[in-house]
């Protein structure tokens, strides 16, 4: 589709994706991988590593399949990292997710790509 | 401050003539963002009209104009227009020129506006 | 194309008083929509951005929400000022508007 049409083609467009399949999660109305919880995890100092890391602890769980697959594009670090959480803090996947959508659109409207 | 001036319309045009309208922008990085055309008929909605990427070598028009005008712009001069052709009676709108909200993107949400150039078609 | 429509068309409101405006799209446009105030004679204004964001200057009173193919614009509680034209746009393929709605006073 013409619009938005990224320049700078890659980075954008993956971060484009990303915000489209976190907002069709956030659509759905039924619990989240069973409600899982997620450790919650600093987004601006770790990013999507940690959001990576985090979300790696759910199995069998479809929803987030998609957007796991684009974390692990977007995360281009060598060898795993410790999850950056909050001590001691976890919160149900689905809130992880709306934090994870916020901390992206930021991003992509704010750059620097 | 960041501003948008059009200019071009103003007078009556015959069905079938032509117009180039032109939009004049300032205060900001000109040639690092995308810009648009969007019309709008006496008492009537928003209808957009015409896009055009950052350097000018993406173009997008709506279907009902599609054809008949052409968008284009002079990074140098930070200018971009939009050449009117075979002009029909519903092409009757005020005409606006629109800045896209981030530079990255073609085809966004409009943060600044020109105050519009009107174009009348009639004979 | 993407179809935007807009319900209601009009509405009368008093000052105070919150409102809402719904904006339906024909297919998914995920959250690219935007929302626009005009008053008569002047340019759009830009309100609301990627479904949900305000932009910069726009006071707090108005807000948007929803994704997919169905979106809202609240206003809060309305001013004086806020007596206008309201128009969504989706720019998730090139760019359409919904018809508008005009919120007269009561």
């Known amino acids: 589709a013409p619009g938005p049409v990224p320049r700078s083609v890659s980075l954008p467009l993956t971060l484009k994706e990303l915000i489209e399949e976190l907002s069709n999660i956030t659509q759905d109305q039924t619990p989240l991988c069973n409600g899982s919880m997620v450790w919650s995890v600093d987004l601006a100092a770790g990013g999507f590593c940690v959001a990576l890391d985090s979300l790696t602890n759910i199995s069998n769980c479809n929803a987030i399949y998609r957007t796991q697959r684009i974390l692990h594009g977007l995360c281009n670090r060598k060898a795993p990292t410790t999850v950056s959480s909050l001590p001691d803090t976890k919160i149900e996947v689905a809130h992880f997710i709306t934090k994870l959508l916020s901390y992206t659109k930021q991003l992509f409207r704010h750059g620097p790509f | 401050q960041v501003q948008l001036q059009e200019s071009g319309g103003g007078g009556l045009v015959q069905p079938g003539g032509s117009l180039r309208l032109s939009c004049a922008a300032s205060g900001f990085t000109f040639s690092s963002y995308g810009m648009s055309w969007v019309r709008q008929a006496p008492g009537k909605g928003l209808e957009w009209v015409s896009s055009i990427s950052a350097s000018g070598d993406s173009t997008f028009y709506a279907d009902s104009v599609k054809g008949r005008f052409t968008i284009s712009r002079d990074n140098n001069k930070n200018m971009v227009f939009l050449q009117v052709n075979s002009l029909r009676a519903d092409d009757t709108a005020v005409y606006f020129c629109?800045?896209?909200?981030?530079?990255?993107?073609?085809?966004?949400?409009?943060?600044?506006w020109g105050r519009g150039t009107t174009v009348t078609v009639s004979s | 194309d993407i179809q935007l429509t807009q319900s209601p068309s009009t509405l009368s409101a008093s000052v105070g008083d919150r409102v809402t405006i719904t904006c339906r799209a024909s297919q998914s446009v995920s959250l690219w929509v935007a929302w626009y105030q005009q008053r008569p004679g002047k340019a759009p204004k830009l309100l609301i951005y990627d479904g949900s964001t305000l932009q910069s200057g726009v006071p707090a009173r108005f807000s948007g929400s929803g994704s997919g193919t169905e979106f809202t614009l609240t206003i809060s509680s309305l001013q004086p000022d806020d007596f206008a034209t309201y128009y969504c746009q989706q720019y998730k393929t090139f760019s359409t508007f919904g018809q508008g709605t005009k919120v007269e006073i009561k």
């Open positions: 629109a800045k896209d909200w981030s530079q990255w993107l073609v085809g966004d949400a409009f943060d600044v």
